[in-house]
Interface confidence: medium
């Protein structure tokens, strides 16, 4: 070896200076007597080497690199050899940082493997080989006094976690645990954890299961679910509390939490849910009352709540066929008694013959809001129920009785807007229990089957706003019937429009007779049109050649009119305006000429 490098330190803080010397022995006879020593860091020549001959004839060059900014580089000592640079010796230099204090040390006890897994964040890159060691000792109390050390746990390269196996764990006392980081520039230690491995148990959630229905057990109530859960066996001896969360599968509802719940539940009934709704449920547990970590949420269980029997009031109304009074058309409307009144699957009308205990005869079963059936001759009353898979609503009795109550008076109707009509009346004496209001298209489109109806439960009401099935320009027949305890009063009816249309055209004017100063006109009235209000009056207009206008108002029953005070041998333009409350329309213009003074009158 002709040359040898020595350095002040092969590993330094990044950015620190480093000093190196290179000595070339005298016996390297093939070299120049006064060789010039060069320095190279990586591929770059470094100026600043101070060279001297020592007393023993060797050559020495010393260089100081003021800042080593490479995390790893080779420093070479070289000589010029012919046209090339000859490397006599080289050393590897490394620069970096001492290890930062490892932070966020945390541990979890895995009960399945009975091992303690600890993890930490190693901190910023040191650029140097750095070893981490998980160190621990056993201790009673709060780890102020250190007992025997536990075997060090060394993670695999590059990992920031380590697993202390069961054989090195102490399940019956505390452990002090910390991480030590070490490299060539120093050592650092994390803050110490003092823990009982059981305080950091990672629990697994129980398994949710639906209850197997047993024949003797009552089915769950509407809006309830029966379920149970099987605890995770390795955690059975740990005191825990659990919580359940649930939400409807459909819609945007957020999770609702229920708890605390016991770890073991042979049976649990969750109520207050929406009936007939599919729910997703999950459970999780935490060590309690002592410190711990929540388990993950369990896999979902999907269950459907039972539905509730309909809780509705059924408002009913009926009508007999005029040609066959035993054929009854029954109408009804469900009125919810609660916010969630249950799904209605259908309706049943039935009759219980007197003297036949328990025998119930169905008269009709339908999903519609009406049905027509033949009423048995001895039947005065039928029962109506709404039903679904959970049961039936309370039966609504429908009594078929004669109209024996007093009638209401002064029935009238008026438009509120194009889509509603107000019907008013004077209540009879005594007050009825309520009223049935029916409405539908009046003649010529009237039809009993297409009527809309409503029950007014307030017997003191003096009117009702019809908002359903009202369209403008249609004539409506409105029928109001008072209802009494066991009978009803006679029905009254009235006709009305919610909005009427102006006449579509006025009658054509015809000239019947004409003279020198008069003209007799006539017209045929337009037949009444559905949706158009009756005419209130006509106005006849006439204009002379000098553009002077004259008019006269005629009543709606007029069929003709005589214009007087005309000028002989003069031209007149005449038209008729037909007016109703909804507007007016003009006829076409009739032009005529009065006779000359010497002409004879035309009849």
């Amino acid at each position: 070896e002709c040359g040898h490098i020595s350095v002040s330190a092969p590993i330094v803080h990044l950015g620190d200076p480093i000093t190196a010397s290179c000595i070339i022995k005298q016996n390297c006879s093939h070299l120049d007597p006064e060789p010039q020593i060069l320095w190279r860091l990586g591929a770059e020549l470094q100026p600043g080497g101070r060279q001297q001959r020592l007393s023993d004839g060797t050559q020495e060059s010393i260089i100081t690199l003021p800042h080593l900014n490479h995390t790893q580089a080779f420093l070479s000592c070289c000589l010029n050899w012919g046209n090339s640079l000859q490397i006599l010796d080289q050393v590897e230099l490394r620069a970096g940082y001492p290890p930062a204090i490892p932070h966020n040390l945390s541990c979890l006890m895995n009960l399945t493997t009975s091992s303690l897994i600890c993890q930490w964040e190693p901190g910023p890159e040191t650029h140097l080989p750095t070893s981490f060691t998980l160190k621990s000792f056993k201790s009673r109390g709060n780890c102020q006094t250190q007992g025997d050390s536990i075997l060090d746990c060394v993670p695999k390269d590059g990992q920031s976690h380590c697993c202390i196996p069961r054989k090195h764990l102490l399940l019956y006392q505390n452990m002090g645990i910390w991480v030590q980081a070490e490299n060539a520039l120093g050592t650092s230690m994390s803050p110490q954890l003092c823990l009982d491995p059981m305080d950091v148990v990672k629990l697994e959630p129980p398994m949710l299961r639906t209850m197997d229905p047993s024949p003797e057990a009552a089915p769950p109530q509407a809006g309830c679910l029966q379920l149970c859960w099987e605890p995770w066996q390795p955690g059975l001896h740990i005191n825990q509390k659990c919580e359940l969360r649930h939400k409807p599968q459909r819609g945007e509802a957020s999770w609702a939490l229920v708890g605390p719940l016991p770890l073991e539940a042979l049976q649990y009934e969750l109520c207050g849910l929406l009936p007939a709704t599919a729910y997703t449920l999950q459970i999780r547990c935490i060590r309690w009352p002592l410190p711990g970590h929540w388990s993950d949420w369990s896999p979902s269980l999907e269950l459907r709540t039972t539905e509730r029997a309909p809780t509705v009031r059924l408002d009913t109304w009926w009508r007999q066929r005029q040609l066959d009074p035993r054929t009854v058309q029954l109408f009804w409307k469900p009125v919810p008694l609660e916010e969630d009144s249950g799904r209605i699957q259908g309706y049943v009308v039935s009759w219980r013959p007197s003297g036949q205990a328990g025998a119930i005869l169905p008269l009709c079963n339908t999903t519609e809001l009406s049905c027509t059936f033949h009423l048995p001759s001895e039947a005065q009353e039928v029962a109506l129920v709404a039903y679904n898979s959970a049961g039936t609503s309370r039966p609504t009795p429908v009594v078929f009785s004669e109209s024996r109550g007093p009638a209401l008076t002064r029935l009238h109707a008026m438009a509120r807007d194009p889509h509603s009509l107000w019907v008013g009346w004077e209540p009879p004496n005594p007050w009825p229990q309520g009223y049935v209001i029916e409405w539908g298209l009046g003649p010529p489109s009237a039809s009993n089957s297409n009527k809309t109806w409503r029950m007014e439960q307030n017997g003191r009401a003096t009117g009702f706003l019809l908002k359903e099935n009202i369209r403008p320009f249609q004539l409506y027949e409105i029928i109001v019937t008072p209802l009494y305890q066991d009978t009803m009063g006679p029905s009254q009816h009235v006709y009305a429009y919610s909005q009427e249309m102006a006449p579509s055209h006025a009658p054509e004017l015809h000239l019947k007779h004409i003279g020198k100063t008069w003209a007799q006109l006539e017209w045929v009235p337009e037949p009444p049109e559905l949706g158009k209000s009756p005419l209130t009056h006509y106005t006849i207009f006439w204009t002379n050649a000098q553009n002077q206008s004259f008019s006269a108002i005629l009543n709606a029953s007029s069929r003709g009119f005589v214009l007087h005070g005309l000028e002989p041998a003069s031209l007149y333009h005449i038209h008729l305006m037909a007016a109703s409350q909804a507007g007016a329309t003009n006829s076409t213009v009739l032009t005529l000429m009065t006779l000359t003074p010497e002409g004879s009158e035309l009849h």
Partner: antibody, heavy 118, light 107 residues
């Protein structure tokens, strides 16, 4: 000197309840696991239940799970065993036990006899 | 749960004999095995913990060995006060079952 003194044993009818107590002295009670071990007449030792120093871990033998409850009051240096739904096979001498750091039973009480009979 | 099986259930021996009792765990328990001695009408007493560690005050003629599933309690020279029932117990998991016991009687 460590002392463990059990009390609360006696005669009880099947289906009845009993509460055993163990008063501890001579050591820092709150730092140690404690437990109960029983021995039926003429039979071997049977571990019943243990409780961690803080009270949060309470394993039970399958034969008593759901019927017996172990608890402790560190402020009173006392260990308890609440026994419900007692059966004839629960008849035994019940020992209070102090556990060591490796789960071994370092100290034993003198025992209290529980007899379940109609 | 781990089961502990002791054998023999009883043995007869004379003073001065070497006595060996075995205990087998139904699964590996490392060295977490403890031995107890019980005399009639008395509470048990800890002899050996963690397979081979002699409890303070216990004569050195008692020794323990083994790890994993098979363990042995040896009394090198039986003394009159050693006639008693001996129990093994595991403490690897939180359930702490005992073996069925071995009664050592005078021959």
């Amino acid at each position: 000197e460590v002392q463990l003194l059990e009390s609360g044993g006696g005669l009880v009818q099947p289906g009845g309840s009993l509460r055993l107590s163990c008063a501890a002295s001579g050591f820092t009670f709150s730092l140690y696991w404690m437990g109960w071990v029983r021995q039926a007449p003429g039979k071997g030792l049977e571990w019943v239940s243990s409780i961690s120093s803080s009270g949060g871990v309470t394993p039970y033998a399958d034969s008593v799970k759901g019927r017996f409850t172990i608890s402790r009051d560190n402020s009173k240096n006392t260990l308890y065993l609440q026994m419900n739904s007692l059966r004839a096979e629960d008849t035994a001498v019940y020992y209070c036990a102090k556990l060591g750091e490796l789960g071994e039973i370092r100290e034993w009480g003198q025992g209290t006899l529980v007899t379940v009979s109609s | 749960d781990i089961q502990m099986t002791q054998s023999p259930s009883s043995l007869s021996a004379s003073v001065g004999d070497r006595v060996t009792i075995t205990c087998r765990a139904s699964q590996g328990i490392s060295s977490y095995l403890n031995w107890y001695q019980q005399k009639p009408g008395k509470a048990p007493k800890l002899l050996i913990y963690y397979a081979s560690n002699l409890q303070n005050g216990v004569p050195s003629r008692f020794s323990g060995s083994g790890s994993g599933t098979d363990f042995t309690l040896t009394i090198s020279s039986l003394q009159p006060e050693d006639f008693a029932t001996y129990y093994c117990q595991q403490s690897w998991v939180y359930h702490l079952p005992f073996g069925g016991g071995t009664k050592v009687e005078i021959k």
